[in-house]
Interface confidence: low
Amino acid sequence: MSLLSVPHTESVSLSTGSTVTIEARPLVCFFNEPHLQVDFHTEMKEDSDIAFHFQVYFGNRVVMNSREYRTWKEEVESKNMPFQDGQEFELRILVLEDKYQVMVNGQAYYNFNHRIPVSSVKMVQVWRDISLTKFNVSN
């Protein structure tokens, strides 16, 4: 199975009902504290606003946030940690009417209410300490 380059950046157009699917594996064991970061940007630039920031501190916690006018807003933290050390996982981010719902291996674990219109999202970036085998957007 071929690996996608990381950071992986893709132009997208999202709306209610869209699903972003990511298949990946942590690069190192959890003891070494790998991260996964997924950012939904409002422009095709890394320094643009972020409608949805999803960061996994493997073996520890998950943080969600948005960045508006270059300022990070109120962080939402979850201690739910369904990711397993050394195991491949499937991450699905569902765009619902009122929120993003994040599913891990088919189960819903995280919710993040929309702060910036989904129609503003132009690019998704997946990066940090993972090997990436799949990135797909379905509308």
Partner: nanobody, 121 residues
């Protein structure tokens, strides 16, 4: 297989403290996340506290500030200390082990049989 056996339950007065123990035998105890759940009569099983294999702890909002969870890997035992007990803490308390750090009863790999804690006013 991982066998889990609790002890320490019983009848206590409101305002008192209690320490529950959960002794493990079988598989490598230290590689599991350890959880405590409870089930009050007629209610669903609810999450109480978690202890990650790396040592991080987390207590549910219902017991926050009154709860301490710890483990002794040398003794293969996990402990739940509950302070300032209330009548609404009355329940059967279950120890559980999971490979995933998830506060969902359905995600647990192993369960103990449960120990009854009754808090009288």
């Amino acid at each position: 297989q991982l066998q889990l056996v609790e002890s320490g339950g019983g009848l206590v007065q409101a305002g008192d403290s209690l320490r529950l123990s959960c002794a493990a035998s079988g598989r490598t105890f230290s590689s599991y996340h350890m959880m405590w759940f409870r089930q009050a009569p007629g209610k669903e099983r609810e999450f109480v506290a978690a202890l990650a294999w790396r040592g991080g702890t987390y207590c549910a909002n219902s017991v926050k500030g009154r709860c301490t969870i710890s483990r002794d890997n040398a003794q293969d035992t996990v402990y739940l200390q509950m302070n300032s007990l209330k009548p609404e803490d009355t329940a059967v308390y279950f120890c559980a082990a999971s490979r995933r750090y998830v506060f969902d009863p359905s995600a647990m790999d192993y369960w103990a049989k449960g120990t009854l804690v009754t808090v009288s006013s």
